[in-house]
């Protein structure tokens, strides 16, 4: 069973009084409809809450929305609906919050059918004041901020126009028509696809990919026969239709589309899809859908160029395009990812990788858990994690797995222990070492969040009944204490804490219901008095990540280096604080063959770490194309894994071979690369 509130648990003394003094209730003067909440800036304490209420009338829907602002992390709210002239805000666009600490907010208003364009409300001072602006178009999408300059906005119109503003939405200019998809790249570059004939849908596979680096003054066509495109890390991907048939394949660029290479990935047919699961500046995880309606595909991991791919995981669960996958980046430990596979018997099993997709294994069975009914052998089974797929299937799973970069090693997730994911009510499990070992943390489904960089974990039971109790732990989920935050239970709808897990405040959202009315209510609890003092050096201990065998000289080595972290001792009840920075010390490891992937034209036979030459390339359904033309590829068969920092040790040098293969892609020909001016 999960560790409970027994006598042996480390108790926080007098916590009821401390929390009672720091619990703030706010009742919203609203009928219950929907509520959305956004944090404005980092460590500012500013929260915007938009409540909307729809009354369906015979002919139309009458809507009313209210806007509230808090500047103390949700302890108090002020109704600021008058700042937006009591206008009804369109919830499907949400609140567009500017990047970093720009303090910018854009709200998109509902306008009457006959109006010439839409209307937005803009704030540059963390929502203290708003300016109303009438748009020369009706927006189709939320305003998109340039990551580099929050004054630059782009939006698509309902008539497929691409609109840009250079002064934070004050003035707008249509820079291109017939646009399907637009995205900001780096350095204020915009990438977008356009159609020539009918529409985005009709021209799918015949779209052109354009780029502008000067906000629409000039353009460059960087791709034709485009099906779709995506950005990930420093990579620009395009799926491109083949000449001869209806298949398409991925091309990749690392220079913003000036030159392209064909990715060594299988081509896909009309009913299949590619999906970038994760990408950083080193590499990319790519999912390639299997032919037919299987619900699974294959994960491939790229080299540093995004060109050569290694098969990482078969039968990877991914239902349909834009559908559900459980693929999760465990952000609390480098190199760790969790996902689900669909096994031959159609059961779903969880897999984990600790080395960025090099090897996948099942999750170790938690020490304090028994194998469930799905297990053939009651002594041997694994933990299986519920993520997006389970949530989409309406299983009793209120939350996806949670990890935070500044709460090193901590992963919290719903799961079941057996041979596969179970449809039974799940429990909550925690790992404190990035997924190597797990412990049952709470019985039954819960909402959970991490505060103060892991110093506090807060949880609320998932129940259909009204609740008034919150649970918290100061020792990474080993021991729990309960606090009754209100006498009158509320129907719980959500737990909100500032993104980044640095805050010590938690807001509990819900509604109260009486015979006549129901109202939104929030309770904000500040845990600062529970963690009375600032943590000192003595409160931290040294931890080696990825350690599995201390007797192995290279214990802890992942991707060529090991990292030691200073971590808060479980018994220390103190504040990491807002300015907490994870202290880590890397040390370089010696290279082994595991630090290299096989280059184009080479493969690793089963259970062998050496790369051997493929007998002939033709039989492997691989096409290789570098920079859009026929190329010589010189290789010694090995290429360092992206992000690997190893030095010395094994140096797999052998004769350099010339692999020449006809580039069959006509994706880009030089005449297509002419510049166009607006």
């Amino acid at each position: 069973s999960a560790p409970g509130e027994d006598e042996e648990c480390g108790r926080v003394r007098d916590f009821v009084a401390k929390l009672a003094n720091n619990t703030h209730q706010h009742v919203f003067d609203d009928l219950r409809g929907s509520v959305s909440l956004s944090w404005v800036g980092d460590s500012t304490g500013v929260i915007l809450v938009l409540t909307t209420f729809h009354v369906p009338l015979v002919i139309m829907t009458f809507g009313q929305s209210k806007l509230y602002r808090s500047e103390d992390y949700g302890k108090n709210f002020k109704d600021i609906t008058d700042l937006i002239n009591n206008t009804f805000i369109r919830t499907e666009f949400g609140m567009a919050i500017g990047p970093e600490n720009s303090g910018k907010v854009v709200l998109t208003a509902e306008v009457s059918g006959g109006s010439r364009g839409g209307r937005i409300f803009r704030s540059s001072d963390f929502a203290k004041n708003f300016v109303q602006t009438d748009l020369p178009f009706h927006p189709l999408t939320q305003m998109m901020y340039s990551p580099q300059n929050s004054d630059y906005l782009l939006a698509l119109s309902t008539e497929n126009g691409l609109w840009v503003s250079k002064n934070f939405g004050g003035k707008w200019e249509e820079i291109h028509k017939a646009v399907c998809l637009a995205k900001w790249g780096s350095d204020n570059t915009i990438f977008f696809t356009t159609y020539a004939n009918g529409s985005c849908k009709a021209d799918l596979g015949a779209l052109e990919l354009w780029r502008t680096s000067d906000l629409g003054k000039s353009f460059k066509t960087i791709g034709v026969k485009i099906y779709s495109f995506g950005l990930g890390g420093r990579f620009l991907f395009a799926s491109v239709m083949a000449d001869k048939d209806t298949t398409r394949r991925i091309h990749v660029s690392t220079d913003q589309g000036d030159t392209w290479s064909m990715a060594q990935l299988p081509s896909v047919g009309q009913e299949q899809f590619y999906s970038i699961l994760a990408a950083n500046d080193d590499m990319v995880f790519m999912h390639v859908d299997e032919p037919g309606d299987t619900g699974f595909g294959t994960i491939f991991t790229s080299d540093d160029r995004g060109i050569v791919y290694s098969k990482s995981l078969d039968r990877h669960l991914y239902t349909t395009t834009g559908g559900e996958t459980d693929f999760t980046n465990v952000t609390s430990l480098r190199g760790v990812y969790i996902t689900s596979v669909l096994s031959e018997d159609n059961s779903i099993q969880t897999m984990i990788t600790f080395d960025q997709g090099g090897r996948w294994t099942h999750l170790r069975k938690p020490e304090n858990s028994e194998c469930d009914a799905t297990a053939k052998n009651k002594n041997e089974c694994s933990l299986h994690i519920h993520a997006s797929y389970s949530i989409s299937q309406k299983l009793n799973v209120p939350m996806a797995p949670l990890s935070e970069p500044n709460a090193v090693g901590i992963v919290i997730a719903h799961g079941s222990v057996g041979d596969a994911i179970s449809v039974m009510v799940p429990d909550v499990y925690i790992s404190d070492d990035g997924g190597y070992s797990w412990t049952k943390m709470l019985e039954g489904p819960h909402y959970y969040t991490i505060l103060d960089s892991g110093g506090i974990i807060v949880a609320i039971e998932h129940s259909s009944r009204p609740i008034n109790v919150i649970k918290f732990s100061t020792d990474e989920g080993q021991c729990w204490q309960t606090y009754t935050f209100t006498r009158d239970p509320i129907y719980f709808t959500g737990l909100a804490s500032e993104p980044g897990a640095r805050s010590m405040n938690i807001s509990i959202w819900g509604f109260t219901e009486s015979a006549l009315t129901s109202q939104w209510v929030s309770y904000t609890i500040d845990f600062k008095d529970i963690l009375e003092r600032n943590c000192e050096e003595k409160d931290y201990t040294i931890w080696l990540a990825h350690s599995t065998d201390p007797e192995d000289y290279e214990d802890g080595c992942i991707l060529g280096y090991k990292e030691q972290f200073l971590r808060l001792r479980k018994s220390s009840v103190c504040q990491n604080g807002r300015d907490y920075v994870v202290t880590k010390q890397p040390s370089i490891c010696l290279c082994s063959l595991e630090d290299f992937l096989c280059d184009f034209g080479y493969y690793r036979p089963e259970n062998d770490s050496k790369c051997v030459e493929q007998p002939e390339l033709k039989g492997h359904d691989l096409e290789f194309c570098l920079y859009g033309r026929e190329e010589h590829l010189t290789t010694n068969g090995y290429r360092k894994i992206p992000g690997d920092k190893c030095q010395g040790g094994v140096n797999p040098v052998r004769e350099v071979k010339d692999l020449k293969k006809k580039c069959t892609s006509n994706f880009l020909s030089p005449e297509k690369q002419n510049s166009k001016s607006n």
């Epitope: 042996e8 648990c9 480390g10 108790r11 070492d433 190597y436 070992s437 020792d475 080993q478 021991c479 003595k538 201990t541 040294i542 931890w543 080696l544 990540a545 990825h546 350690s547 201390p550 007797e551 192995d552 000289y553 214990d555 802890g556 090991k562 030691q564 001792r569 479980k570 018994s571 220390s572 010390q585 040390s587």
Partner: antibody, heavy 124, light 106 residues
Framework: QVQLVQSGAEVKKPGSSVKVSCKAS????????ISWVRQAPGQGLEWMGG????????NYAQKFQGRVTITADESTSTAYMELSSLRSEDTAVYYC?????????????????WGQGTTVTVSS | DIQMTQSPSTLSASVGDRVTITCRAS??????LAWYQQKPGKAPKLLIY???SLESGVPSRFSGSGSGTEFTLTISSLQPDDFATYYC????????FGGGTKVEIK
């Protein structure tokens, strides 16, 4: 089998310093923390501090902070403990001990291998 | 620092007796407790780690229990070789030892 061999007995004058060495053989020295523990005649055990050879992370008991320096030389698999400003109360047997390790935590699993001890006598 | 209080300080027992030594921490240390045996003129020897895990090579008559602040070392049937001094040690703060319990022949 891992062994820790310590340097020989020392006789020191008050106010001086002593440096005791602890050489490991037969194991992966770099992957374990080494602790220093002392025992005054007829008294109990007292932890002074420890070091992790990789990165040289040292930490010390508050009582000895500023007076003790623990170092490690990975190339020779040797740990050192230097105690300065010696007084007669520092007369004790000084042990080095390897911290057992089952996970990534260096100090949580007890001291599974001990040196034979080094007697330090402080006398004027 | 976390204080460790061991009791009793001296314990007289006979061969075959069941012996229990307790150790109390000044604050919760989860299960991060070790037990050692020391004989005169010798270095301590690890018996138990993580409160209840038996170190390899240690006879099964030794067992440990407890978590949080209360811990116990039990020798189920005292053998002649077991007369020694026993120490508990916590590892969740800067390491501290208990004062020791001397088990002597009755």
């Amino acid at each position: 089998q891992v062994q820790l061999v310590q340097s020989g007995a020392e006789v020191k004058k008050p106010g001086s310093s002593v440096k005791v060495s602890c050489k490991a053989s037969g194991g992966t020295f770099r992957n374990y923390a080494i602790s220093w523990v002392r025992q005054a005649p007829g008294q109990g055990l007292e932890w002074m501090g420890g070091i992790i050879p990789i990165g040289g992370w040292a930490n010390y008991a508050q009582k000895f902070q500023g007076r003790v320096t623990i170092t490690a030389d990975e190339s020779t698999s040797t740990a050192y403990m230097e105690l300065s400003s010696l007084r007669s109360e520092d007369t004790a047997v000084y042990y080095c001990a390897r911290q057992g390790r089952k996970t990534g935590y260096y100090y949580y699993y007890g001291m599974d291998v001990w040196g034979q001890g080094t007697t330090v006598t402080v006398s004027s | 620092d976390i204080q460790m209080t061991q009791s009793p300080s001296t314990l007289s027992a006979s061969v075959g007796d069941r012996v229990t030594i307790t150790c109390r921490a000044s604050q919760s240390i989860s299960s991060w407790l070790a037990w050692y045996q020391q004989k005169p003129g010798k270095a301590p020897k690890l018996l138990i780690y993580k409160a209840s895990s038996l170190e390899s090579g240690v006879p099964s008559r030794f067992s440990g229990s407890g978590s949080g602040t209360e811990f116990t070392l039990t020798i189920s049937s005292l053998q002649p070789d077991d007369f020694a001094t026993y120490y508990c040690q916590q590892a969740d703060g800067h390491i501290t030892f208990g004062g020791g319990t001397k088990v002597e022949i009755k």
